[in-house]
Interface confidence: medium
């Protein structure tokens, strides 16, 4: 329904607090280098303007679109060209091209300093001195580092962040109370950002149809008692929400997400028996809870899929009637029966079914042609099952750190052109699949593991897209969204790679490594491991293990020495020489 003033409409729907927070997130996700104070000023100006439109929707400029209003505001930033270079050219364009231009300049890996956590007392003082500014700063810092973070979900994180400080800054042991909560929020936040990044990549690179197919499969697994019409309605609404958020339309997105949560709760009897607790919560918690809700139990008496999708003489007629609807029904019926499959596997099966019908419905005897289509599914199902079994066995044998190292070696050999920081980050995340998923029983392993790997490999794809260096990565990332993981799994050692020149500086370490956290120390060692493989791609596991064991012993020895820096200098030279000899460099 049309509103005279879109900005007034959203202000009234969302309320001032959420409106301001969402505008801040939107601006920080677009202009990632701008100082906090500049963004706060812009947000306050937009908010004051919105209030004038609420008072009188016919007031000047109140009828303008949100893109026009926000784009005009962003283009008033004085240092736009100095700070952002060619992004300033966006301001010469008209809507909707201007917004598209801003979207294209979002940077998944902005050159921003790492967020360093101050002392607990310092944080608590800042929180008490000015709670509003403290929380706005949190939104700003997360949004600019994660330009596709799901905005309504970031409001939920901010609410939890505030609750943590409110509780812990009064506690006897502030640090013991606060630090685990902040660690949890950080880890959950990174995971949430990566999941949303995949949704946006799916929409932007593969289109609405790809996203809708993903949503049909996931919602059918989650709500197996819901009818196809119900699932289709939810998919349509969910697609709208994510299209808006991925497109920078954060006010509309948050508003529509709230409407969707309301609809789901009002109709939970025909959706899922698991929603009751979620629906008793306040809005932000409710939406989060619904998004994470466990799968409902499958109806007991579901008939065989073969009857309608293979044995029926009407299969080709049904398919011809409305291809996407029929394929959607196939995906719905298959997914609700298989909560034990990953979404990407279900999508591969649907694609195989579609390809078979395309071929067979044009054949002389269609039924004879597609009669064995379900047999084609067997190898597709077994491939991820076997891969997960092997990797979980390896994880249980090695533990997380060494499992990550095995993946670091594996992926560096596959795509050695990729930057070392990216290989370390992606392989570490790939390695976390072990502790995340291998603990689950068989029926939950595949959806956990393969869908998580899709999220992590998308990180590789978006980081690589910024500075493409490997045709193999580009190929796996762009050919098929659902076959990304099998594509990377199938890559062997890149025989065309010319080993990197040896540089002793890369393997020179200093006493500062001793004061690093365990995680940071691991990253240093894993960075060295990637560099080793880049120098010697044909090194055996045994050779690499020997060098890494020596390296660990060297760090441990020098960190215990009285004169640490001298130890690192002298022992480091010996280690480099010994490593070169061991690897034949």
């Amino acid at each position: 329904d049309a509103h005279k003033s879109e900005v007034a409409h959203r202000f009234k729907d969302l309320g001032e607090e959420n409106f301001k927070a969402l505008v801040l997130i939107a601006f920080a996700q677009y202009l990632q280098q701008c100082p906090f104070e500049d963004h706060v000023k812009l947000v306050n100006e937009v908010t004051e303007f919105a209030k004038t439109c609420v008072a009188d929707e016919s007031a000047e400029n109140c009828d303008k679109s949100l893109h026009t209003l926000f784009g005009d505001k962003l283009c008033t930033v004085a240092t736009l060209r100095e700070t952002y270079g060619e992004m300033a050219d966006c301001c010469a364009k008209q809507e909707p091209e201007r917004n598209e231009c801003f979207l294209q300049h979002k940077d998944d890996n902005p050159n921003l300093p790492r967020l360093v956590r101050p002392e607990v007392d310092v944080m608590c003082t800042a929180f008490h001195d000015n709670e509003e500014t403290f929380l706005k700063k949190y939104l700003y810092e997360i949004a600019r580092r994660h330009p596709y973070f799901y905005a309504p979900e970031l409001l939920f994180f901010a609410k939890r962040y505030k609750a943590a400080f409110t509780e812990c800054c009064q506690a006897a042991d502030k640090a013991a109370c606060l630090l685990p909560k902040l660690d949890e929020l950080r880890d959950e936040g990174k995971a949430s950002s990566a999941k949303q990044r995949l949704k946006c990549a799916s929409l932007q690179k593969f289109g609405e149809r790809a996203f809708k197919a993903w949503a049909v499969a996931r919602l059918s697994q989650r709500f197996p008692k819901a009818e196809f019409a119900e699932v289709s309605k939810l998919v349509t609404d969910l697609t709208k929400v994510h299209t808006e958020c991925c497109h920078g339309d954060l006010l509309e997105c948050a508003d529509d997400r709230a409407d969707l949560a309301k609809y789901i709760c009002e109709n939970q009897d025909s959706i899922s028996s698991k929603l009751k607790e979620c629906c008793e919560k306040p809005l932000l918690e409710k939406s989060h809870c619904i998004a994470e809700v466990e799968n409902d139990e499958m109806p007991a008496d579901l008939p065989s899929l073969a009857a309608d999708f293979v044995e029926s003489k009407d299969v080709c007629k049904n398919y011809a009637e409305a291809k996407d609807v029929f394929l959607g029904m196939f995906l719905y019926e298959y997914a609700r029966r298989h909560p034990d499959y990953s979404v990407v596997l279900l999508l591969r099966l649907a694609k195989t079914y579609e390809t078979t019908l395309e071929k067979c419905c044009a054949a002389a005897d269609p039924h004879e042609c597609y009669a064995k289509v379900f047999d084609e599914f067997k190898p597709l199902v077994e491939e991820p099952q076997n891969l997960i079994k092997q990797n979980c066995e390896l994880f249980e044998q090695l533990g997380e750190y060494k499992f990550q190292n095995a993946l670091l070696v594996r992926y560096t050999k596959k795509v050695p052109q990729v930057s070392t920081p990216t290989l370390v980050e992606v392989s570490r995340n790939l390695g976390k699949v072990g502790s995340k998923c291998c603990k689950h029983p068989e029926a939950k392993r595949m959806p956990c593991a393969e869908d998580y790997l899709s999220v992590v490999l998308n990180q590789l794809c978006v980081l690589h897209e910024k500075t493409p260096v490997s045709d193999r990565v580009t190929k796996c990332c762009t050919e098929s969204l659902v076959n990304r993981r099998p594509c990377f799994s199938a890559l062997e050692v890149d025989e065309t790679y010319v080993p990197k020149e040896f540089n002793a500086e890369t393997f020179t370490f200093h006493a500062d490594i001793c004061t690093l956290s365990e995680k940071e120390r691991q990253i240093k060692k894993q960075t060295a491991l990637v560099e080793l493989v880049k120098h010697k791609p044909k090194a055996t596991k045994e050779q690499l293990k020997a060098v890494m064991d020596d390296f660990a012993a060297f760090v441990e020895k020098c960190c215990k020495a009285d004169d640490k820096e001298t130890c690192f200098a002298e022992e480091g030279k010996k280690l480099v020489a010994a490593s070169q000899a061991a690897l034949g460099l």
């Epitope: 009818e227 196809f228 019409a229 009637e321 029929f326």
Partner: nanobody, 124 residues
């Protein structure tokens, strides 16, 4: 929820005509199948014919082919069963049913929602 209400049943002579209506209300969907079934005294419920809402394509059971016609009125959300040359063996309670999706559905299990039914009696 989708609600279905049949109307138009009654008592007619063999050879006469009758038009049944099925009005649908509730959540709309991009693609629906509307089917007509009937249950004669002491018999199983059997498929009569169906229509794909989006395309208007229809299909029938052999015994009514050429005599019965299904049509739809999108604006009124109503499906019609036009029955000509009625026979005593057409006597039954007639039900309309609906399924979300597409398909030339002929089986009860394929349909989600059902009307209460309307009685058709054909006397000789």
């Amino acid at each position: 929820e989708v609600q279905l209400v049949e109307s138009g049943g009654g008592l007619v002579q063999a050879g006469d005509s009758l038009r049944l209506s099925c009005a649908a209300s509730g959540r709309p969907f991009m693609s629906y199948v509307m089917g007509w079934f009937r249950r004669a005294p002491g018999k199983e419920r059997e498929f009569v014919g169906g229509i794909n809402w989006g395309s208007g394509n229809t299909w029938y059971t052999d015994s009514v082919l050429g005599r019965f016609t299904i049509s739809r009125d999108n604006a009124k959300n109503t499906v019609y069963l036009q029955m000509n040359s009625l026979k005593p063996e057409d006597t039954a309670v007639y039900y309309c049913a609906t399924a979300a999706g597409v398909g030339y559905y002929r089986y009860e299990r394929q349909y989600d929602y059902w009307g209460q039914g309307t009685q058709v009696t054909v006397s000789s």
